[in-house]
C-alpha cells in the first residue's frame, strides 16, 4: 500500500482553508469528488461532493464547505470557511470510482484550528480586494454510500492547502450543518 | 479556433496609466479564471493578476497592488487590466491567459507595454 | 511568497540524450506545480500540472516527477523543437510565483 503522508495546517478560528486537489483530468474530470474527514480509528467520512457527473467549474456548497470541479485544469478546490476549533482533524480528496474503491489524493492535510484573532494578515494573504462571494444558487449533492476497502494501492497525484482570508467577511446564506456521511460501512 | 488576443500596449510615461484589454473566443470565457502574466524583456515569466468566472475573487502579485485592477466582461468576453501610477519596472510583454484557479492552459500572443520618459 | 529556483540556468544536450532540469521550492508547495515551455518570441506551452500529470497532447516523452520541494523535468529523447526555455510554476498559494527558468540548448 502507498505511504500516506500528510501536511499540517495551522490556522485560526474564522479563517479559511483552500485546498487544490490534483487530478489526471482525461481520466476523471466528470468523476465525482469528494471531500473527507478520517478521525482516529474510523473510517472516512465523506463532508461533502460534487455531483454525478461533476459539472465543471459548478459550486457544490454544504454548510461551510464549497467544492468546485475544475475539469480544465483537472483540480478540485475545496474550502472551508469561518473555521472552528472543531474542525481540526486530516482531511483528504477523493474520487468516486464505483465499485472500485475511491481513488485518494495525497496529501491528507492535518487541520489544526485554534482560537484567536484571524484579523492579522497571514503570509498568504493577499490584496484588500479579494472578496469571496458565495453564490445563493450553490447546489447540495448527494453523496454515495458504499463500501470500500481499507487500503489503496494505487499511487495518485496529490493535493495541497492553503490559507485564505480575505480582508472582506465571507457572507454565507442558508448555511446548513455539516453534513457528514459515512462512505465505508 | 482557441483565441485570446491582447491590445492596449503602447509607450506610456512613468506615473501614467493604461489599460490593456484581451478578447477571448472559442473558449467557455464565462466558466474560466483568467489571468494576466507579464515578461520583462529578456527575463522569466511574473504572474500579474488572476480573477474567477464571476470577478468574486481577485488576486494580486505584490508589486503591483493598489495600482492595477483586473476585471472581465462576461457578456463581451473580455479580460481588462487597468494599470495606474506605471514605473519603468512594468515595462513587459503582458500575456493574457486562461487559469488563475492554477496552471495557464491557453495562452495570448502578449502586447508589450513601455513605460520611459 | 514562495521562491522557486530551477537549475541549471542553462543545459546543453544533443539531439536524442535525455535532459533532466530540476526546480526547487523554498517551502512544500505538495503537487501544485506546473511545468512550460517557451520558444523564442512566442507564448509559453503548459506541459505538466500536478507535479507528474502531462497537460492534453503533450508527448509522452516530457514527464514531471517530484512532490513538496524538489520537481523535476525530463525529457527522455530531445527532439529538435524541444530546444527552448523550461519554467516550473507553483500554484498552491495565490501568490503563484515561476522559476527563473532553464534554457535548453544544443550541444
Known amino acids: 500500500a502507498t505511504k500516506l503522508t500528510e501536511e499540517k495546517y495551522e490556522l485560526k478560528e474564522g479563517q479559511t482553508l483552500d485546498v487544490k486537489c490534483d487530478y489526471t483530468l482525461e481520466k476523471f474530470a466528470s468523476s465525482q469528488k469528494a471531500w473527507q474527514i478520517i478521525r482516529d480509528g474510523e473510517m472516512p467520512k465523506t463532508l461533502a461532493c460534487t455531483e454525478r457527473p461533476s459539472k465543471n467549474s459548478h459550486p457544490v456548497q454544504v454548510g461551510r464547505i464549497i467544492l468546485e470541479d475544475y475539469h480544465d485544469h483537472g483540480l478540485l478546490r475545496v474550502r472551508m470557511v469561518n473555521l472552528q476549533v472543531e474542525d481540526s482533524g486530516l482531511y483528504q480528496c477523493v474520487i468516486y470510482q464505483p465499485p472500485k474503491e475511491p481513488h485518494m489524493l495525497f496529501d491528507r492535510i492535518r487541520l489544526v484550528v485554534t482560537k484567536g484573532f484571524s484579523g492579522t494578515p497571514g503570509s498568504n494573504e493577499n490584496s484588500t480586494q479579494n472578496v469571496y462571494k458565495i453564490p445563493p444558487t450553490t447546489t447540495k449533492a448527494l453523496c454515495p454510500l458504499y463500501t470500500s476497502p481499507r487500503t489503496v494501492t494505487q499511487a495518485p497525484p496529490k493535493s495541497t492547502a492553503d490559507v485564505s482570508t480575505p480582508d472582506s467577511e465571507i457572507n454565507l446564506t442558508n448555511v446548513t450543518d455539516i453534513i457528514r456521511v459515512p462512505v465505508f460501512n | 479556433e482557441v483565441q485570446l488576443v491582447e491590445s492596449g500596449g503602447v509607450l506610456v510615461q512613468p506615473g501614467g496609466s493604461l489599460r490593456l484589454s484581451c478578447a477571448a473566443s472559442?473558449?467557455?470565457?464565462?466558466?474560466?479564471?483568467m489571468s494576466w502574466v507579464r515578461q520583462a524583456p529578456g527575463k522569466g515569466l511574473e504572474w500579474v493578476a488572476n480573477?474567477?468566472?464571476?470577478?468574486?475573487?481577485?488576486y494580486y502579485v505584490d508589486s503591483v497592488k493598489g495600482r492595477f485592477t483586473i476585471s472581465r466582461d462576461n457578456a463581451k468576453e473580455s479580460l481588462f487590466l487597468q494599470m495606474n501610477s506605471l514605473r519603468a519596472e512594468d515595462t513587459a510583454v503582458y500575456y493574457c491567459?486562461?487559469?488563475?484557479?492554477?496552471?495557464?492552459?491557453?495562452w495570448g500572443q502578449g502586447t508589450m507595454v513601455t513605460v520611459s520618459s | 511568497e514562495i521562491l522557486m529556483t530551477q537549475s541549471p540556468a542553462t543545459l546543453s544536450v544533443s539531439p536524442g540524450e535525455r535532459a533532466t532540469l530540476s526546480c526547487r521550492a523554498s517551502?512544500?508547495?505538495?503537487?501544485?506545480l506546473a511545468w512550460y515551455q517557451q520558444k523564442p518570441g512566442q507564448a509559453p506551452r503548459l506541459l505538466i500540472y500536478g507535479a507528474s500529470i502531462r497537460a492534453t497532447g503533450i508527448p509522452a516523452r516530457f514527464s514531471g516527477s517530484g512532490s513538496r520541494t524538489e520537481f523535476t523535468l525530463t525529457i527522455s529523447s530531445l527532439q529538435s523543437e524541444d530546444f527552448a526555455v523550461y519554467y516550473c510554476?507553483?500554484?498552491?498559494?495565490?501568490?503563484?510565483?515561476f522559476g527563473q527558468g532553464t534554457k535548453l540548448e544544443i550541444k
Open positions: 480573477i474567477k468566472q464571476d470577478g468574486s475573487e481577485k
Open positions: 491567459a486562461r487559469g488563475g484557479i492554477s496552471t495557464f492552459d491557453i
Open positions: 510554476q507553483q500554484y498552491k498559494n495565490w501568490m503563484y510565483t
Open positions: 517551502q512544500s508547495v505538495s503537487s501544485n
Open positions: 472559442g473558449i467557455t470565457f464565462s466558466n474560466s479564471w
